[in-house]
Interface confidence: low
């Protein structure tokens, strides 16, 4: 039951967090956590990399023309997120949600 609840909350909140709080003032901890999540789980976006198109930061001039954060890159270099190309972007089917689900299943059951 706990797993089901956690799973539901993750699905509901991860996209909101990524789109509204990533790289926003006062949300440095969230930004760092999302970057770490994408790098450690080799994923990009909540459901897929396209989710980042809705991000306030990605839409702003502060993003420097990136279409995804640099933490989506397989090899992270400055501004690597400007090219949303499978050769260097984690294009995992199901995005970070799927990776997190798997992790939770393995560690909480």
């Amino acid at each position: 039951a706990y797993y089901q609840q956690l799973n539901t909350e993750l699905k509901e909140n991860l996209k909101d967090t990524m789109t509204k709080r990533y790289h926003q003032p006062g949300h440095e901890a969230v930004t760092s956590a999302v970057d770490q999540l994408q790098q450690e789980f080799h994923c990009c976006g909540s459901n897929n990399s396209q989710d980042w198109r809705d991000s306030e930061w990605i839409r702003s001039q502060e993003a420097g023309g990136r279409v995804v954060p640099d933490s989506c890159c397989k090899t992270v270099v400055a501004l690597c997120g400007q090219r949303d190309h499978a050769s260097n972007i984690y294009k995992v089917e199901g995005g970070c949600i799927t990776k997190l689900e798997t992790f939770i299943q393995e560690h909480l059951r």
Epitope: E12, K15, K20, R53, D54, R59, S60, Q61, G65
Partner: antibody, heavy 123, light 106 residues
Framework: QVTLKESGPGILQPSQTLSLTCSFS??????????VSWIRQPSGKGLEWLAH???????RYNPSLKSRLTISKDTSRNQVFLKITSVDTADTATYYC???????????????WGQGTSVTVSS | DIVMTQSQKFMSTSEGDRVSITCKAS??????VAWYQQKPGQSPKLLIY???NRYTGVPDRFTGSGSGTDFTLTISNMQSEDLADYFC????????FGAGTKLELK
Amino acid sequence: QVTLKESGPGILQPSQTLSLTCSFSGFTLSTSGMGVSWIRQPSGKGLEWLAHIYWDDDKRYNPSLKSRLTISKDTSRNQVFLKITSVDTADTATYYCARRDHYGDYSYAMDYWGQGTSVTVSS
Amino acid sequence: DIVMTQSQKFMSTSEGDRVSITCKASQNVGIAVAWYQQKPGQSPKLLIYSASNRYTGVPDRFTGSGSGTDFTLTISNMQSEDLADYFCQQYSSNPTFGAGTKLELK
């Protein structure tokens, strides 16, 4: 079918507080991605964005008016409110509310607008 | 704030004309630009979003183009019902609108 309708006092005096209500149907602010903005337009002039409220109660304000603005919502009643303190004749305008669906196909554009409510500040 | 400049306040047109309304952003806004049409006594209506995407039900004579700082709304075959004010808007950061361009008959 999405509809929005603004209501307000019509006329008020300088230094008073303007209270506006946006009543909407066809969507709910409990849905992720939904947001409502307030925009105003003095007669014969351009549009000025005032404030925005997100589904999760996060708020954004026009920096030049921020100290005078308060936006809020009643999700259960499908209403969004805007208060403007210390009004002046320069606040005379038609006030619109508009929907923004952040996760929809139309990105952050304002896809549905209310008919507007006319507000006159006069002594 | 990002300033959106519509340099033409008024444009004289005739039916059948090709009309181009321009809008310039004071800084790079990517493609985060929308265009609205407003007829007298009415609220604005969304025509174009993400710089070049036509909103549902908008006739295909309306076309949006541009990215970065320069944007254009083109009406390829001007109709009398297109006489209205047209506003550009950026939503790269806090939304700001252009001052508007009014289409009039010659």
